[in-house]
């Protein structure tokens, strides 16, 4: 359907593919790509070559190529400013002659190792009540946090640590649509650190 918008997720500095998925390559005359402005035109190559790209905006020079035979478009060395809406007007030899495919490109950083910080709420009768906070280095969009083995969601975890839980390891996993990364802290280390007055744990 012309109205459908396909979300494409890309990683900063890496490549992303827009799935055009042309079923009949021989019918293609030209595909015109636009975003905020004209981006590129893609025309058939000869029998030996992939489709030929003409990049029309200098921000995309030498970062775009098209794959044969399905005309999927690849943008490499992704920049944050590449994010946004893209439109492919596909001109063919046969009816319907022109069809449009729409895309929304979201760009994310590949997540680094998260950092776990801790603060002591209370320590009573050999039970320590600790709050763990998990965060990635740069404030990122669409980052979710999960703690194992408890299965808790969110970047803050409050735990009541008893001597019987000494062998537990708490792992925080940060995830965005393109990557995930984890850090862990052992319960034994946690309460030992608290006893010694430390407030931060970071394995990275």
């Amino acid at each position: 359907k012309d109205s459908e918008i396909f979300t494409v997720n890309g990683i900063l500095g890496e490549s992303v593919t827009f799935p055009v998925n042309i079923q009949e390559p021989r019918q293609v005359k030209i595909i015109a790509w636009t975003s905020k402005t004209s981006v590129a035109y893609v025309t058939p190559g000869d029998s030996e070559t992939a489709p030929v790209v003409t990049v029309t905006h200098r921000n995309y020079y030498e970062r775009i190529h098209a794959l044969g035979p399905n005309y999927n478009l690849v943008i490499s060395d992704l920049r944050m400013e590449d994010a946004g809406d893209y439109k492919a007007d596909i001109n063919t030899q046969a009816d319907p002659y022109t069809t449009t495919k729409r895309y929304n490109l979201q760009i994310y950083r590949r997540l680094g190792k998260p950092k776990i910080t801790q603060s002591l709420m209370a320590s009573v009768n050999s039970t320590c009540n600790v709050t763990l906070t998990c965060s990635v280095e740069k404030e990122e969009k669409n980052v979710t946090y999960n703690w194992s083995p408890l299965g808790e969601e969110g970047n803050v975890l409050q735990i009541f640590q008893t001597p019987e839980d000494q062998e537990l390891t708490y792992t925080c996993t940060a995830q965005n649509p393109v990557s995930n990364n984890s850090d862990s802290i052992s319960a034994r280390q946690l309460c030992a650190d608290i006893a010694m007055g430390f407030r931060t744990h970071h394995t990275g």
């Epitope: 005359k29 030209i30 025309t43 070559t49 030929v52 790209v53 003409t54 200098r58 030498e62 001109n91």
Partner: antibody
């Protein structure tokens, strides 16, 4: 047999306009870029712009925006380039050429002389 | 825009001699194409996609290069090769040409 037949030489006054043509035969006119190139006497080739007749898409060299206007008539397989506000700097031979990978084939050239 | 610089601007070679001319791009390009133009005639596509010979081009011609540096080589110069050769980058609009290398026969 591919052929690009360009219109004849033009002698025009400064400040006026000229429209030159390039009639294509021997290939599917709507499926390829049709480009225009300027060559002044004793000089190299300058790319002006091109048009894809099958969609009406046009690329211009920034230098020639406002100077050159590219159009195409798919019914007669003919491309046109109009040059406006002519000066002596516009005196040159203008070539048309077609292709999607490179300029595969070129017309014979149209000489435009701007003189009062 | 991407600027193509051809060197030398003019050169001469004796029959049988090996000839190399270069085309340098101001920033990286995927391919260049080469055109041959003889005086008073239209240019002809000569080498495309950096190294593919156009139909009818003698095998003594070859093209190579990548990134910002490209070259056209004639293994053994012949009189009919005397012409001006232009490189062009196609994939980034505007589709710029180099200034040309005029090859003369000694």
């Amino acid at each position: 047999q591919v052929h690009l037949q360009q219109s004849g030489a033009e002698l025009v006054r400064p400040g006026t306009s000229v429209k030159i043509s390039c009639k294509a035969s021997g290939y599917t006119f709507t499926n390829y870029w049709l480009g225009w190139v300027k060559q002044r006497p004793g000089h190299g080739l300058e790319w002006i712009g091109d048009i894809f007749p099958g969609g009406g898409y046009i690329n211009y060299h920034e230098k020639f925006k406002g100077k050159a206007t590219l159009t195409a008539d798919t019914s007669s397989s003919t491309a046109y380039m109009q040059l406006s506000s002519l000066t002596s700097e516009d005196s040159a031979v203008y070539f048309c050429g077609y292709g999607n990978i490179a300029m595969d084939y070129w017309g014979q050239g149209t000489s435009v002389t701007v003189s009062s | 825009q991407i600027i193509l610089t051809q060197t030398p601007a003019i050169m001469s070679a004796s029959p049988g001699e090996k000839v190399t001319m270069t085309c340098s791009a101001s920033s990286s390009v995927s391919y260049v194409h080469w055109y041959q133009q003889k005086s008073g005639t239209s240019p002809k596509r000569w080498i495309y996609d950096t190294s593919k010979l156009a139909s009818g081009v003698p095998a003594r011609f070859s093209g190579s290069g990548s990134g910002t540096s490209y070259s056209l080589t004639i293994s053994t110069m012949e009189a009919e090769d005397a012409a001006t050769y232009y490189c062009q980058q196609w994939n980034n609009s505007p589709r710029t040409f180099g200034g040309g290398t005029k090859l003369e026969i000694k």
